[in-house]
Interface confidence: low
């Protein structure tokens, strides 16, 4: 689609006749008719395949014609066409007098003609005027014409449509030759495809407009590259969306179930050994002289009756003493100088000599205990209660409150590995999908940490006159070995010299 | 030389229904997309529908979402647009036209269109 211009400059009929040389009264009162049609090479009457536009009286005999465009007015003359341009032409302007006002073809007589050109040839689209004169015998017209393409019209031939737009379709303006320019934030063959915000990431990230970055599902952040973890996801991260991987020692589907409950709440008190034992299950191992799940309570170290044959135990600062009764020596008063025949044994007890009569034994009835038989059965003193259950004594009958962690009558069942706890001298255990793991404290190795790699119990001479000290690694502690003439776990006691006794 | 010739449009009265048809020749008909615009006399043309060269992105202007579907059939070398519940403001010759890529971006050819009338 576009426009043939036509622009009328100058028309010289110096004589004022008509083309058949008869003369104009009172002068040639001039007009044009144009006819643009296909090109042919012998330009000859017929349609004006192309177009026809007629101009009012431009002037008398000679005259030059006004530029008319900037006024809305008829010069240049425009034949618009509806179709791809050739190239080609053929045009044909004649002049006209018009004796009258009326300036119909029919109205007018037929010798009314001054003069007709007929050109034909190639002509491109373009901008530039071609100027061309036609002279006759008595008439002389100059011209200029080109052709333009219609509003949005662009290409060789006016075929290329391109209409600015800014809308679903596109965004983008049309340059000189019909090439799109993308609005800025768009970019794209047809400018659709909108310029996301600078560093949204390609696959996770979009947008609908310029400089935006939508989220697809799954991702989050200013640019999109940070995946969202599964809903519920307590400890945990991902490297693709709705995954949780959990921290270290956290476990459970959502990561919230503590693995290290030992590192994360340091539960035990009073310097005691604290080891997992599964998820957010502990077990404390005490210093001595405290007690208590959490070794949270000081316990008298004579609780634990450690004076035997009837001794009497007295709480000291640095631990305990046992005042031993007639007969009796030694840390524990465990050393007799009784025989049967002091009848040690009480509570119906019978004795038994050993070492030819040095030593004796005493065998005790039912529901009594003790070296002399001299303590009544308390049917919680077996300790019946495995892995730190709590022994209650229920009438004729005992029952075991378990430790978490642990079940079962005695608490002898374990409900995770961990439970009951495997890993020797305070080490640390780890619940394994299969099986579990040891982390040894300093000075202790193995899979369970039995095996003891530096700790020496006899390095800090616990050994009274020149006994020799051994080390006994199964049970972490020392056995001395006295000199003659002396007795006593430490060899502190000399033969022959008991103890006096207050009584 | 790339063709598209319209056919299918007539007068019909408001709430009727009609189907244009698009016969493409001169391309690889499968590699382009399709689309119809329509002018009314002393109106703007307006894109109503197009299509993709596969078929699966498909537009409609608002004015007749809902009311035109576009389709196409590869092995025949056919658009079709059928328009149900038509308007009086439906009135408009019918273009069908390609951009000569797999977008529905641009017009680059288009056919001569069909006069559809739409009047009681």
């Known amino acids: 689609s576009g426009v043939f211009q036509l622009q009328l400059q100058e028309f010289i009929n110096e004589r004022g006749v008509l083309a058949s040389g008869r003369p104009c009264e009172p002068g040639c009162r001039t007009f044009f008719r144009v006819c643009l049609k296909h090109f042919q090479a012998v330009v000859s009457p017929g349609p004006c395949t192309f177009g026809t536009v007629s101009t009012p009286v431009l002037g008398t005999n000679s005259f030059a014609v006004r530029d008319d465009s900037s006024g809305g007015g008829r010069n240049p003359l425009q034949l618009p066409f509806n179709f791809t341009w050739p190239g080609t032409f053929s045009l044909i302007i004649e002049a006209w007098h018009a004796p009258g006002d009326d300036l119909r073809p029919e109205a007018l007589p037929p010798d009314a003609l001054i003069s007709k050109i007929a050109i034909q040839g190639s002509l491109a689209v373009g901008q530039n005027w071609l100027l061309d004169e036609q002279t006759s015998t008595l008439t002389r017209l100059r011209y200029s014409y080109r052709v333009i393409c219609s509003d949005n019209y662009y290409g060789d031939n006016c075929s290329r449509l391109c209409k600015k737009r800014n809308d679903h379709f596109g965004h983008y303006v049309c340059q000189p030759d019909g090439n799109l320019s993308c609005l800025p934030g768009w970019t794209g063959e047809y400018c659709q495809q909108p310029i996301c915000l600078s560093g949204c990431h390609e696959q996770n990230g979009y947008c609908s407009k310029p400089a935006e970055c939508l989220c697809r599902p799954g991702w989050q952040g200013r640019l999109c590259n940070e995946c969202i973890p599964h809903n519920g996801c307590r400890h945990g991260t991902c490297s693709t969306p709705w995954q949780c991987t959990c921290d270290e020692g956290w476990g459970g589907l959502f990561c919230d179930q503590d693995l290290n409950y030992c590192t994360h709440h340091s539960p035990c008190k009073n310097g005691a050994t604290c080891s997992n034992s599964g998820q957010r299950s502990y077990t404390c191992t005490c210093r001595p002289g405290y007690t208590g799940v959490d070794c949270e309570l000081e316990l008298s170290e004579c609780d634990s009756n450690p004076c035997r044959n009837g001794g009497s135990c007295k709480d000291q600062e640095d631990g305990y003493h046992c005042l031993c009764p007639p007969g009796y020596y030694g840390l524990h008063c465990e050393h007799s100088t009784l025989s049967c025949a002091d009848s040690p044994c009480f509570n119906g007890g019978s004795c038994r000599e050993r070492n030819q009569g040095a030593n004796y034994a005493c065998e005790c009835p039912p529901n009594f205990t003790g070296s002399n038989c001299e303590k009544k059965v308390d049917r919680c003193t077996s300790n019946p209660c495995a892995n730190g259950g709590q022994c209650l004594n229920r009438g004729p009958s005992r029952m075991c409150r378990c430790r978490p962690g642990f079940t079962g009558t005695y608490c002898e069942l374990h409900v995770s590995d961990c439970a009951r706890n495997p890993c020797a001298h305070g080490g640390t255990c780890h619940d394994l999908e299969n099986g579990l793991m040891c982390t040894c404290p300093a000075g202790f190795s193995g899979r369970r940490c039995e095996v003891r790699t530096s700790i020496d119990a006899c390095a800090s001479s616990p050994c009274f006159n020149r006994a020799t000290c051994y080390t006994d690694l199964s049970t972490d502690t020392f056995v001395c070995n006295c000199p003659y003439g002396f007795v006593g776990s430490r060899c502190e006691f000399p033969v022959g010299l008991p103890p006096s006794f207050p009584w | 030389e790339v063709q598209l010739v319209e056919s299918g449009g007539g007068f019909v009265q408001p709430g009727g229904s009609l189907r244009l048809s698009c016969a493409a020749s001169?391309?690889?008909?499968?590699?382009?997309?399709i689309g119809w615009f329509r002018q009314a006399p002393g109106k703007e043309p307006e894109e109503i529908s197009c299509?993709?060269?596969?078929?699966?992105?498909?537009y409609y202007a608002d004015s007749v979402k809902g009311r035109f579907t576009i389709s196409r059939d590869n092995a025949k070398n056919t658009v079709y647009l059928q328009m149900n519940s038509l308007k009086p403001e439906d009135t408009a010759v019918y273009y069908c036209?390609?951009?000569?890529?797999?977008?529905?971006?641009?017009?680059?050819?288009w056919g001569q269109g069909t006069q559809v009338t739409v009047s009681s």
């Open positions: 036209a390609t951009p000569g890529i797999a977008a529905c971006r641009g017009i680059h050819y």
């Open positions: 001169g391309f690889t008909f499968d590699d382009y997309a």
């Open positions: 299509i993709s060269s596969s078929g699966g992105i498909t």
